[in-house]
């Protein structure tokens, strides 16, 4: 085997990784909240908006106590991948009205991507199961009108806000078990 190697290079402890993941999730939550408010100011929402292709909310806050670490991280990763795909679609096909949300929407996409990588790294460091992502869903159809794009944006940002809020609570609870 040869001589023992020198001191290994330092990388974050999984608990420190979880701390920074919580911080990143909180930051993303604040970004999403701000962007949703910006959207409401420019294009007031007339009631709740839904998009069938969005994931259903993972868990109520009351049910968090029963969660296990792999389940939380796996579900969170799957849901955030779906939201990433929707944000990419919104930027590409949302129409000229939504151009007013740039560059914030681009920043949101980049941070979402970073959070996904952080979650994957955490799962690797803990050696938790990492099931493959669901097979790619059929491409999202472009909005039927400018107003359709705005309604979709309300639904995406609203759903992402709820998911990230759940994620912060879930990750903080999991920290106590690690």
């Amino acid at each position: 085997p040869g001589p023992p190697p020198g001191p290994p290079r330092v990388s974050p402890d999984p608990r420190a990784e979880l701390d920074s993941t919580v911080l990143l999730t909180r930051s993303l939550l604040a970004d999403t909240r701000q962007l949703a408010a910006q959207l409401r100011d420019k294009f007031p929402a007339d009631g709740d908006h839904n998009l069938d292709s969005l994931p259903t909310l993972a868990m109520s806050a009351g049910a968090l106590g029963a969660l296990q670490l792999p389940g939380v991280l796996t579900r969170l990763r799957a849901d955030l991948l779906s939201y990433l795909r929707h944000v990419q679609w919104l930027r590409r096909a949302g129409g000229s009205s939504l151009k007013t949300l740039e560059p914030e929407l681009g920043t949101l996409q980049a941070r979402l991507d970073r959070l996904l990588r952080r979650l994957q790294l955490l799962m690797s460091r803990l050696a938790l199961p990492q099931p493959p992502p669901d097979p790619p869903a059929p491409p999202l159809a472009p909005p039927s009108s400018a107003w359709g794009g705005i309604r979709a944006a309300h639904a995406i940002l609203g759903g992402l806000h709820l998911t990230l809020d759940w994620a912060v609570r879930g990750l903080l609870l999991l920290k106590t078990r690690l």
Epitope: S11, L81, S124, L126, A127, Q130
Partner: antibody
């Protein structure tokens, strides 16, 4: 300083058994998934097995499934690999590794030969 | 045969930039799983060089950089030095194994 120290390697006959140990220090052992990775003489790295931070998940490469068992004792900061029904092709340096893997031990040589 | 494909050898002269590729499939790298790179100096254990496609652990010089696109990844070493002569391995999670898969390794020679 992070340290992973493997022991238990040696010469064993085909069909025999060996138990490798890996003593960990300098980091929170119970927060890391742990791997065994091997390297046959002059060859590349081959992943062997992994165990989750709390021991609840264990996975094996097809080449060792049913013959090798990975386990850990978080109270002793120690990782184990029980190797049964050893074959000549199991001859390699066996490394224990933590995390991604982020940290590696210096390895212990297992030789399977008659 | 390795699940991740790397060129068996690469070479360069001191000061040069060298790139090592790592090609996977839709079941590992292409499914969004991150790529990690290891350096194994002669006679020693592997060391983590790059994690999560492009992140450098503390202590790793910024001459080393990683990137990922589609089903492949690459490691770039700029300002090549004689002490960079080593074997380099890429690795990625493979859900069918529930564990990491390694590339076959690339032997880097500094001429």
């Amino acid at each position: 300083e992070v340290q992973l120290l493997e022991s238990g390697g040696g010469l064993v006959q085909p069909g025999g058994s060996l138990r490798l140990s890996c003593a960990a220090s300098g980091f929170t052992f119970s927060s890391y998934g742990m791997h065994w990775v091997r390297q046959a003489p002059g060859k590349g790295l081959e992943w062997v097995a992994v165990i989750s931070y709390d021991g609840s998940y264990k996975y094996y490469a097809d080449s060792v499934k049913g013959r090798f068992t990975i386990s850990r004792d978080n109270s002793k900061n120690t990782l184990y690999l029980q190797m049964n029904s050893l074959r000549a092709e199991d001859t390699a340096v066996y490394y224990c590794a933590a995390g991604v893997p982020d940290y590696w031990g210096q390895g212990t040589l297992v030789t399977v030969s008659s | 045969q390795s699940v991740l494909t790397q060129p068996p050898s690469a070479s360069g002269t001191p000061g040069q930039r060298v790139t090592i590729s790592c090609s996977g499939s839709s079941s590992n790298i292409g499914s969004g799983y991150d790529v990690h790179w290891y350096q194994q100096l002669p006679g020693t254990a592997p060391k983590l060089l790059i994690y999560s496609n492009e992140e450098r652990p503390s202590g790793v010089p910024d001459r080393f950089s990683g990137s990922k696109s589609g089903t492949s990844a690459s490691l770039a070493i700029s300002g090549l030095r004689s002490e960079d002569e080593a074997d380099y391995y890429c690795a990625a999670w493979d859900p069918s194994l529930s564990g990491p898969v390694f590339g076959g390794g690339t032997k880097l020679t500094v001429l």
